[in-house]
Interface confidence: low
């Protein structure tokens, strides 16, 4: 039975040209995290593999930095970065846990970070 839950940074906003940290945290399970994938819609951004370390997709390597922890830092944000991001925790023996973050990149200089929330 899958007992874990994923906490994420939730719905967040940031300024165009700035940077943002996407973070997820898996709790309430003793399952071993083997790999974490970060995806934007259907595009792979990065992989953090327990054995092999980080891999950043070539098309994002200039704007994506690994960490902190299992999180991901997006830099030089553009309005086109607005959208859904997913952290996909591959664990054993539980299987896959998925967290969702919605990022809005604003032209305005006023960009408030959303509160953390737990996915039901």
């Amino acid at each position: 039975m899958m007992t874990g839950t994923i906490e994420t940074t939730g719905n967040i906003s940031a300024e165009k040209g700035g940077s943002i940290i996407l973070q997820c945290h898996l709790s309430s399970t003793t399952a071993q995290v083997t790999q974490v994938n970060w995806e934007q819609q259907d595009q792979l951004l990065a992989i953090c593999n327990a054995d092999l370390g980080w891999h950043i997709s070539p098309s994002f390597k200039d704007r994506v930095a690994p960490g902190p922890g299992l999180g991901l830092t997006l830099q030089s944000l553009t309005v086109n970065d607005t959208g859904e991001y997913f952290c996909i925790y591959h664990t054993y023996p539980d299987g896959t846990y998925t967290g969702r973050i919605f990022l809005e990149v604003l032209e305005s200089s006023v960009a408030e970070h959303g509160a953390r929330f737990q996915i039901p």
Epitope: N37, E39, L44, I47, T96, P120
Partner: nanobody, 120 residues
Framework: EVQLVESGGGLVQPGGSLRLSCAAS????????MGWFRQAPGKEREFVAT????????FYADSVKGRFTISADNSKNTAYLQMNSLKPEDTAVYYC?????????????WGQGTLVTVSS
């Protein structure tokens, strides 16, 4: 709501191959990950493999790594499990499972299962 229907099970000799299919219908846009579990007679259901919506993230149980391959065809809304070098201990009912984007993990939706028997 999402419905999952498995097919492709049957009787195969040790060392043989089978390909299972899991066809998704309904609110398929809400699916984020799909995977396979199995349950042998008298045993608990165990995780086999999983694949993320984009197809770039896959993970396997140690017992099937190198022998089984999970894949997905988004145009057909179908996930596949190619099983090679089958062993008698692979005999089980194989279940397809899926998770929603906002889910905590695989197992939101289950298929009815398809029986795989490996015997000479």
């Amino acid at each position: 709501e999402v419905q999952l229907v498995e097919s492709g099970g049957g009787l195969v000799q040790p060392g043989g191959s089978l390909r299972l299919s899991c066809a998704a219908s309904g609110s398929i846009s809400s699916i984020h990950a799909m995977g396979w579990f199995r349950q042998a007679p008298g045993k608990e259901r165990e995780f086999v493999a999983t694949i993320s919506r984009s197809g770039v993230g896959t993970f396997y149980a140690d017992s099937v790594k190198g022998r089984f391959t999970i894949s997905a065809d988004n145009s057909k809304n179908t996930a596949y499990l190619q099983m090679n070098s089958l062993k008698p201990e692979d005999t089980a009912v194989y279940y397809c499972a899926s998770s929603y984007s906002s889910s905590s993990g695989l197992g939101d939706i289950w298929g009815q299962g398809t029986l795989v028997t490996v015997s000479s």
